[in-house]
């Protein structure tokens, strides 16, 4: 069920149109329930999930993450800062979900749900960013080449980069989700 | 099973620092989503929220206690610490370590520490 | 910071009858509301998250609703063991807020 029109909403006809932060919010959440099955996938079919921190720690992907320097954490929060690292990292993370699209059996229009919800979210943040001009959209071309470069792991490799990307943007979105709602 | 056990002197006097720690089991502190929280009771009066620290180690603290609170964890120990300086007889209280843990952060404490009440 | 508001502040009742308690929020919280029970001498135990689900483990005789701004906790059926404290919780941003709590008694 795609955010806003759950059995809530419809239950409560009295209620106000979602603001632009309710409805952030619920996207996020809807997109965290999208990686929670595809997670469920990966973990069933491998045992990546098991693998320690320092192993998942060796693969060179370059995935964003919340620092404290991003403005998004309590000490040091900055709205405007912490909103474009926010944008500029699910951006990054673009290329990583495409890559994702191949890589589910029976989970496969989950993954595309969570890459679709993930451009709307994008297009919601950037509706609410003033800086605009400040978000680095990643070069096609690297890209590109990045992409190609996954895809060309073995499949150990290519199960522990899927399991790293989820991971990752789980966390991602958490923080996100954290930090946007004390704006 | 996840459990939590705070501990620290039941007396303190005027003035004096006082320093908690949770130890806790059954979950960690460096997985996404969670955070341990700290929660105290005066006796026969309201919860009130204290302090709370994340996975990542962002932290929060109540805005009228802020300047005297101080929130740290040990992951490989699984502990989360607080400071409390310049201690007064209104914070006599029975003081709760909690953990907070689901994916949406709901900001909701799942499991609670028995508590250790601090005069 | 958004202040939580319980009514009523203490209420009783017999075994098997059915309450409602109230939790106001100063602003809109959406869902992000939870719900505590404690008993004297105990620490709290969560028993409703994100305004309306149950934790693992609490019995179906309560049920947690609303959104927004306005709550309400309904425990149908008391039972003995449901006497104590009950503390609503703004679970949307920091600083988080506690109720001032409703007493009820059996």
């Known amino acids: 069920v795609p955010p806003g029109e759950d059995s809530k909403d419809v239950a409560a006809p009295h209620r106000q149109p979602l603001t632009s932060s309710e409805r952030i919010d619920k996207q996020i959440r809807y997109i965290l329930d999208g990686i929670s099955a595809l997670r469920k996938e990966t973990c069933n079919k491998s045992n990546m999930c098991e693998s320690s921190k320092e192993a998942l720690a060796e693969n060179n992907l370059n995935l964003p993450k919340m620092a404290e320097k991003d403005g998004c954490f309590q000490s040091g929060f900055n709205e405007e800062t912490c909103l474009v690292k926010i944008i500029t990292g699910l951006l990054e993370f673009e290329v990583y979900l495409e890559y994702l699209q191949n890589r589910f059996e029976s989970s496969e229009e989950q993954a595309r749900a969570v890459q679709m919800s993930t451009k709307v979210l994008i297009q919601f943040l950037q509706k609410k960013a003033k800086n605009l001009d400040a978000i680095t959209t990643p070069d096609p071309t690297t890209n590109a080449s990045l992409l190609t470069k996954l895809q060309a792991q073995n499949q150990w490799l290519q199960d522990m980069t899927t399991h790293l990307i989820l991971r990752s943007f789980k966390e991602f979105l958490q923080s996100s989700l954290r930090a946007l709602r004390q704006m | 099973q996840v459990t939590l056990k705070e501990s620290g002197p039941t007396l303190v006097k005027p003035t004096q620092t006082l320093t908690l720690t949770c130890s806790f089991s059954?979950?960690?502190?460096?997985?996404?989503?969670?955070?341990v929280g700290w929660v105290r009771q005066p006796p026969g009066k309201a919860l009130e929220w204290l302090a709370f620290i994340w996975w990542d180690d962002d932290k929060y603290y109540s805005p009228s206690l802020e300047s005297r609170l101080t929130i740290t964890k040990d992951t490989s120990k699984n502990q989360v610490v607080l400071t409390m300086t310049n201690m007064d007889p209104v914070d006599t209280a029975t003081y709760y370590c909690?953990?907070?843990?689901?994916?949406?952060?709901?900001?909701?404490?799942?499991?609670w520490g028995q508590g250790t009440l601090v005069t | 910071d958004i202040q939580m508001t319980q009514s009523p502040s203490s209420l009783s009742a017999f075994v098997g009858d059915g309450v409602t308690m109230t939790c106001w929020a100063s602003q809109s919280i959406n869902d992000y509301l939870n719900w505590y029970h404690q008993r004297p001498g105990e620490a709290p135990e969560l028993l409703v998250f994100?305004?309306?689900n149950l934790q693992i483990g609490v019995p179906s005789r309560f049920r947690g609703s609303g959104s927004e701004t306005y709550f309400t906790l309904t425990i149908n059926s008391l039972q003995p063991e449901d006497s104590g404290t009950y503390f609503c919780q703004n679970g949307h941003s920091f600083p988080l807020t506690f109720g001032g709590g409703t007493k009820l008694e059996i």
């Open positions: 059954g979950f960690s502190l460096s997985t996404s989503g969670v955070g």
């Open positions: 994100a305004a309306s």
């Open positions: 909690a953990r907070s843990a689901d994916d949406y952060l709901y900001y909701s404490f799942d499991t």
